[in-house]
Amino acid sequence: YGSGSKLKVPELSLKGTQHVMQAGQTLFLKCRGEAAHSWSLPTTVSQEDKRLSITPPSACGRDNRQFCSTLTLDTAQANHTGLYTCRYLPTSTSKKKKAESSIYIFVSDAGSPFIEMHTDIPKLVHMTEGRQLIIPCRVTSPNVTVTLKKFPFDTLTPDGQRITWDSRRGFIIANATYKEIGLLNCEATVNGHLYQTNYLTHRQTNTILDVQIRPPSPVRLLHGQTLVLNCTATTELNTRVQMSWNYPGKATKRASIRQRIDRSHSHNNVFHSVLKINNVESRDKGLYTCRVKSGSSFQSFNTSVHVYEKGFISVKHRKQPVQETTAGRRSYRLSMKVKAFPSPEIVWLKDGSPATLKSARYLVHGYSLIIKDVTTEDAGDYTILLGIKQSRLFKNLTATLIVNVKPQIYEKSVSSLPSPPLYPLGSRQVLTCTVYGIPRPTITWLWHPCHHNHSKERYDFCTENEESFILDPSSNLGNRIESISQRMTVIEGTNKTVSTLVVADSQTPGIYSCRAFNKIGTVERNIKFYVTDVPNGFHVSLEKMPAEGEDLKLSCVVNKFLYRDITWILLRTVNNRTMHHSISKQKMATTQDYSITLNLVIKNVSLEDSGTYACRARNIYTGEDILRKTEVLVRDSEAPHLLQNLSDYEVSISGSTTLDCQARGVPAPQITWFKNNHKIQQEPGIILGPGNSTLFIERVTEEDEGVYRCRATNQKGAVESAAYLTVQGTSDKSNLE
């Protein structure tokens, strides 16, 4: 490498991860790096060994900017086999965690295939079931074939998974079981010679599962009381433990300690060590440690002990003296900051009475009062009473709880009608919202207009999403407002605000909203203000009962905000079942400002057209079909007849006279008048009365004398009557004749 190249890790002269050399040869290793470095050697190589020499790092490389060091081991032996490492010194500028290079050197010796030989006395290897177990029969050459055997006859064959062979470490058993407990040996045959090194596995049944001290820390006592601490150690089945205590008075043996074993658990041991000090004093305060040892396992548990000369109580507000919550909350915790010893008796008062007696919803938890399912009844003054009778200590502290309520509009909770009410056109209307909330809500009225559009069948675009306007009594939006007022009233024992909007003249459809808000929330009630020019929003009319051959004229008018799909149907009863027959040739419905009109005209009716006619419309809000019925009875035709025949009549000249021709018939007969066989037309001085049934002649002249005939006619026939009208006081000429 040139001096320009940075060596992140030191570089060794021997490349690769391992190197095999023969025993008796000299090991020569050079390390080059960017900084000062040191060597780490196998435990079997002593730094004092005269055969070992290490030169301290000195400048080397191009421009002498690098550091080099050499390690020389003369006449290397089998037990010098191991890992040789060159690493940067931690004080150097290199911040790398693993700024080191290593090589594993095998010093091969045919006479010593194993680095360590245990022939007569097996080496003790501790094992824990379920954990990794290493039988450390490391070898001096990676080429040595080693077999693992268990006394007397078993061979443990490496499978690459549970049991593996590593020439640097030995046999690795991934999760040891009790089957590996006993005498194991590693065997290697080199040049026909069998070498054996022996290991005795010893199962460490020293699993400490848990250590606890009761009572839990911290332990508080008054001067003169007795301290009892129970330390429990839970272990696996065949595990022994040694339990000891460290505590402030240990030197003077202040405590008595007794031990016992709880054998009530089938799967483990529970060892108890109970420390007891009678009449504790200040010197007994401090840290108490229970120490549990089992083989190489060790666990400890601490607890702190406080000794007080006398009892005390200190109480403060944890939050503000005045606290707020909201009705409907699942729970609210009123909490005080209390420091006291010994534990005081606690009583909570609400408005001077014991809280827990007032309601089962009040629960005392430590120095807190928990209020379940908060209601307005929970507002009030809460006092915590704390007392330590034996010390004659008593303290109390009061907090005020305000229970806020989100606004509620009572008219919303009353089951509303399935479809909105209709307001008669031009009527005066009083709209009311009754509101409750804490703090007292502010109420505003709003108007959402419906945009007028006659081409629409109804105002289905008139929704709450429309732009809204805040109203005041002088507003000219929508309908003329007479007043907006508010008054307080007590309903069911609570103060409620009644807000009233008076509409002076119902003209414009839309939506009125009353909105109530306080700091907890907002609630709104929408009042659909649908104006109607139809009584009850649905009206059916029959022009007149038709006779055979006449036209039937029916009219249906519905409020367009409430109804749609208007149609006429004829109801017929067949076998006690009412059938709905649709009527063809219906006219198109016409839409007006407030209503939809559908007229039905049936020309030239016959008797068969008699029946129950119904106008059907669908309620937009309920989806229900509404029927309004009218009975139509087509009258049978009947030839005309006169109720009274005309009779001859004398009238004075210049007088007036009336001829009456009352006829009956179905359909109603047409009356025609004749004088001397000429049809009489209405003209000045001659007036035809209603339906032509009367003939009135003003200022009679002699020309009016003659034969008058009336004829009553309908499809069934005709009838007539005649009479002679004589005019008295005519001229002489007439007399002569």
Epitope: L237, R263, S266, H267
Partner: antibody
């Protein structure tokens, strides 16, 4: 090599006392607990009692009044005494090393209770 | 006492086949330190019982991986794959969670 071997009479008269011995090797009674388990004919095994490694004892409450378990660690032996035997006590009696589970069992001794 | 119920009482299976033995306890076998002490044993003809599986699913060293244990709480299963002639015998489950230690009444496995 862990081994357990039970010994005792094969035939016991009703109302008499059964005495069984379990001799162990390959482990120490000071390190491991040991249990007695029996298997009545045609039934599943029944645990009788446990001798803990430290000499403590635990009995199955169903048999407690009739059982005594003890040991001689110097001889690596555990003893079971069961009194007031009835015919339904007939079965094979095993001693078993008790290390959370019964990991090693003796070959068992068949005990018949009959007059 | 915890009652251990084994099903079936006996079963006949072909060599190479697979079996499942069920064991149900009358109450949970999870102990206070979270372990479940449920074991499976085999008693081959004219032999003493031999531990196969401990703590529900841990196979004893030297036991073939054809044997597997599973389950939790109160329901446990022993599965044996690729049945061999040496597998015949009576299989027992046992609990070591609570005194008295109890066993199932056994499932006899026969080879067809």
């Amino acid at each position: 090599q862990v081994q357990l071997k039970e010994s005792g009479p094969g035939l016991v008269r009703p109302s008499e006392t059964l005495s069984l011995t379990c001799t162990v090797s390959g482990f120490s009674l000071s390190d491991y607990s040991l249990s007695w388990v029996r298997r009545p004919s045609g039934k599943g095994p029944e645990w009788l009692c446990r001798l803990w490694f430290d000499g403590d004892t635990t009995y199955n409450s169903a048999f407690k009044s009739r059982l005594t378990i003890s040991r001689d660690t110097s001889k690596d032996q555990v003893f079971l005494k069961m009194n007031s035997l009835q015919t339904d006590d007939t079965g094979t009696y095993y001693c078993t090393r008790d290390d959370r589970d019964f990991d090693y069992w003796g070959q068992g001794v068949m005990v018949t209770v009959s007059s | 006492d915890i009652v251990m119920t084994q099903t079936p009482v006996s079963m006949s299976v072909s060599l190479g086949g697979q079996v499942s033995i069920s064991c149900r306890s009358s109450q949970s076998l999870v102990n206070n330190n979270g372990n479940t002490y449920l074991s499976w044993y085999i008693q081959k003809p004219s032999q003493s019982p031999q531990l196969l599986i401990y703590k529900v699913s841990n196979r004893v060293s030297g036991i073939s991986d054809r044997f597997s244990g599973s389950g939790s709480g109160t329901d446990f299963t022993l599965k044996i794959n690729k049945i061999e002639p040496d597998d015949l015998g009576v299989y027992y489950c046992g609990q070591n969670t609570q005194y008295p230690l109890t066993f199932g009444s056994g499932t006899k496995l026969e080879i067809k």
